[in-house]
């Protein structure tokens, strides 16, 4: 059966300056390939986090994605600013040259409240 990407929250609200967790779980790690978080869709989408060795300021993984059986690809965004508002997508790729996007969660809106 095809891998499913589950983002359980449609939206989260967070006060400016606070942190928020965006949840994402997969039903399978197959096919082999990376998981990436984006804000927005299409050509203009912005890469927010990749579960690799890259470093992303203010964004960290919630659980240890290096563990073989880990299906949790949630992230934490710290010190949220109004510019962080938008819809965030957890996207599963199949490894290749280039990697192929095969499934996405339904998206979680981040709504930033004034402090």
């Amino acid at each position: 059966t095809e891998v499913k990407v589950i983002q359980p929250e449609k939206s989260v609200s967070v006060a400016a300056g606070d942190s928020t967790v965006l949840n994402c779980t997969l039903t399978s790690l197959l096919p082999v390939g990376p998981i990436r978080w984006y804000r927005g869709v299409g050509q203009s989408r912005q890469l927010i986090y990749s579960f690799t060795t890259e470093h992303f300021p203010r964004v960290t993984n919630v659980s240890d994605a290096t563990k073989r059986s880990n299906l949790d690809f949630s992230i934490r965004i710290s010190n949220v600013t109004p510019e962080d508002a938008g819809t965030y997508y957890c996207v599963k790729f199949q490894r290749g040259s280039p990697d192929t996007e095969i499934q996405s969660g339904g998206g979680t809106e981040v709504y930033v409240l004034a402090k």
Epitope: K10, S13, V41, T87, S104, G106, G107, E109, Y111, L113
Partner: antibody, heavy 119, light 108 residues
């Protein structure tokens, strides 16, 4: 049974205001995000606004931003749409729609209330 | 925003015939797509969600298929009550939530 009953429509002049209400029953109102969707005469459906169950999260279509205000009173199981600075192009049937709990599609709709903006 | 284009605009068919309605998205929405039926004087009704899941109480003559940018609503054998306007809606790229322009299924 889920029921959504809109009211408050009518005929107004451009620049005037109107407040629509949607009385909800048959479900735990405060647990669900709610939306307004409209349909101009002879046209398709257009999403207008949404509000989260708590009332904390609110979004508007660009066409109404700054003129319309969505709100809810969970103690009265009622959704509202305050419409200011109305324009002829706001003429439409306005539907109240309950969202599914997982995704932003609409599992129940009201019958709608007609708003006519004309000089 | 994601634009949904429905085709054809009008479908003229007889009861008992098969109806095939199309909805094309300007960019991938995976399977985050719903279909609604609208009849004059009635509340719109959810038929299909997640591209292919039938809503509660919807007869099995209605089926949805597709993913990415191409979607289809099929009514296997039209009944008199199926003559109506049908809309697709995507809920992946948001806000705003967007609808297609509609397909009218009329009696031939």
């Amino acid at each position: 049974d889920v029921q959504l009953v809109e009211s408050g429509g009518g005929v107004v002049r451009p620049g005037e205001s109107l407040r629509l209400s949607c009385a909800a029953s048959g479900f735990t109102f405060s647990s669900y995000d709610m939306n307004w969707v409209r349909q101009a005469p002879g046209e398709g459906l257009e999403w207008v606004s949404l509000i989260s169950g708590s009332g904390e999260i609110i979004y508007y279509a660009d066409s109404v931003k700054g003129r319309f205000t969505i709100s809810r009173d969970n103690s009265k199981n009622t959704l509202y749409l305050q419409m200011n600075s109305l324009r002829a192009e706001d003429t439409a049937v306005y539907y109240c729609a309950k969202e599914n709990n997982r995704y932003r599609f609409f599992d129940y709709w009201g019958l709608g209330t007609l708003v006519t903006v004309s000089s | 925003e994601t634009v949904l284009t429905q085709s054809p605009g009008t479908l003229s068919l007889s009861p008992g015939e098969r109806a095939t309605l199309n909805c094309r998205a300007s960019q991938s929405v995976y399977t985050y797509l719903a279909w609604y039926q609208e009849k004059p004087g009635q509340a719109p009704r959810l038929l299909i969600y997640d591209a292919s899941s039938r809503a509660t109480g919807i007869p099995d003559r209605f089926s949805g298929s597709g993913s990415g940018t191409e979607f289809t609503l099929t009514i296997s054998s039209l009944e008199s009550e199926d003559f109506a306007v049908y809309y697709c809606q995507q809920y992946y790229d948001r806000p705003p939530l967007t609808f297609g322009g509609g397909t009218k299924v009329e009696i031939k």
